[in-house]
């Protein structure tokens, strides 16, 4: 569809009528002088010679002349009102590729590459200072101590999830990251004794401390990663280190 629909222009042609003026002239009437005779009248004589021209007659009425040739076209009339919109035309062909503002098509690509490089550097800094990376997972802590509900909310806020090790390497990475016990994304809140991840899936990897899980106090539905790398079940109301995992 055209961004600026064409507006039809109506041109009105004004033709001027041309005319021609013709004048007709009448003959002057001749007058004969009266003759006085003393004898009886004779027969009429032959007509006399023509008299002198009479005085010029008054101007006659205009005569009916022949129609003259068509005159030249008159001046352009004012534009008429816009006509109704026409029905949409057929879809036009794909236009040619537009040019970048400065005509340099490599600029956007170079900027994107620079941004990607900078992001990679920031990831490395984060890994070096705060986090640990294993495969396509990045474990990060903000160093805060909080309840399990708060940890869940914190991780979701940053589009991450509570750290959940799926193998020994991931478990070791979290262990190396923490300086105190940290919550894992594992609970048996739904079914007592059946520990699952936060999406409800059964665990394929566990690293329980000796004698755990023991559900001491009947309310130990959450799981802690101890500093020795082993797991312990604890109440979810306790406060421990928050560790989130980010997919990369």
């Amino acid at each position: 569809m055209s961004l600026f629909p064409s507006l039809p222009l109506l041109l009105l042609s004004m033709v001027a009528a041309s005319y021609s003026e013709t004048v007709t002239c009448e003959d002057a009437q001749k007058t004969c002088p009266a003759v006085i005779a003393c004898s009886s009248p004779g027969i009429n004589g032959f007509p006399g010679k023509d008299g002198r021209d009479g005085t010029k007659g008054e101007k006659g009425e205009p005569g009916q002349g022949l129609r003259g040739l068509q005159g030249p076209p008159g001046k352009l009339g004012p534009p008429g009102n816009p006509g109704p919109s026409g029905s949409p035309g057929p879809k036009g062909q794909k236009g040619d590729p537009g040019k970048s503002p400065d005509g340099d098509s490599s600029l956007a690509a170079s900027e994107r590459k620079a941004l990607q490089t900078e992001m990679a550097r920031i990831k490395k800094w984060l890994t070096f200072s705060l986090g640990k990376q294993v495969g396509n997972k990045f474990f990060l802590t903000n160093g805060e101590i909080m309840t399990f509900e708060k940890v869940k909310a914190l991780c979701v806020k940053f589009q991450a999830s509570v750290a959940t090790p799926r193998n020994a390497a991931e478990n070791g990475a979290i262990q190396n990251l923490i300086k105190e016990e940290a919550f894992l994304g594992i609970t048996d809140e739904k079914t007592e004794g059946q520990f699952v991840d936060l999406t409800g899936n059964r665990l394929t990897y566990t690293n329980w401390n000796e004698g755990e899980p023991n559900n001491a106090g009947s309310d130990e539905d959450c799981v802690l990663l101890l500093k020795n790398g082993q797991w312990n079940d604890v109440p979810c109301s306790t406060s421990h280190l928050a560790v989130c995992e980010f997919p990369i």
């Epitope: 101590i145 909080m146 309840t147 509900e149 708060k150 105190e180 016990e181 809140e189 001491a216 106090g217 009947s218 309310d219 130990e220 539905d221 500093k227 109440p235 979810c236 109301s237 306790t238 406060s239 421990h240």
Partner: antibody, heavy 115, light 107 residues
């Protein structure tokens, strides 16, 4: 967050002690564990038990057979019931919010068990 | 149950003195130990969590240290408002227990 204990100050031996803790400024179903703690005349503190935000309970084994903690979520209250009391149960009873530590406490209510 | 033993039972000091209060656990509790202050006719107030972590609103003269079984609460230059009872509490093992308390009194 404020917690306020209420209930009778005097209970007869062998009867049941019932206390209410009214919480304002925070929903007891949102998070944390909601506890009862008592302090004996000699200043010794004893954790009695809690009801968590999810409704699960945990009790001190020394009291388990005669203690019960329940709640009324519509009133944002939780309750302590201690059965078969003796004079040894005379104490100041506190309700408190727990998250590994007790950050918020009620002002306490003294309960005397006496004939 | 884990038993927490506080010492001394009573400590008499002069305002301006610096003091240390001890809390010993019957078995290792990592750093799962918290300190409270209780003034006469008041509820306990949290001073330190996880052995050494400060609490918002608590004066900086209060500090904690220790791990495993031995813990210390230090008060740098005691003020008159600091007199009262001090308790430790562990959250490492259920049931959660308190120490017997140390009474800090004016000499």
């Amino acid at each position: 967050v404020q917690l306020q204990e209420s209930g009778p100050g005097l209970v007869k031996p062998s009867q049941s002690l019932s206390l209410t803790c009214t919480v304002t400024g925070y929903s007891i179903t949102s998070d944390y564990a909601w506890n009862w703690i008592r302090q004996f005349p000699g200043n010794k503190l004893e954790w009695m038990g809690y009801i968590s935000y999810s409704g699960s309970t945990s009790y001190n084994p020394s009291l388990k057979s005669r203690v019960s903690i329940t709640r009324d979520t519509s009133k944002n209250q939780f309750f302590l019931q201690l059965n078969s009391v003796t004079t040894e149960d005379t104490a100041t009873y506190y309700c408190a919010r727990w998250e590994s530590w007790f950050a918020y406490w009620g002002q306490g209510t003294l309960v005397t068990v006496s004939a | 149950d884990i038993v927490l033993t506080q010492s001394p039972a009573t400590l008499s000091v002069t305002p301006g003195d610096s003091v240390s209060l001890s809390c010993r656990a019957s078995q290792s509790i990592s750093n799962d130990l918290h300190w409270y202050q209780q003034k006469s006719h008041e509820s306990p107030r949290l001073l330190i969590k996880y052995a050494s972590q400060s609490i918002s609103g608590i004066p900086s003269r209060f500090s904690g240290s220790g791990s495993g079984t031995d813990f210390t609460l230090s008060i740098n230059s005691v003020e008159t408002e600091d007199f009262g009872m001090y308790f430790c509490q562990q959250s490492n093992s259920w049931p959660y227990t308190f120490g017997g308390g140390t009474k800090l009194e004016i000499k």
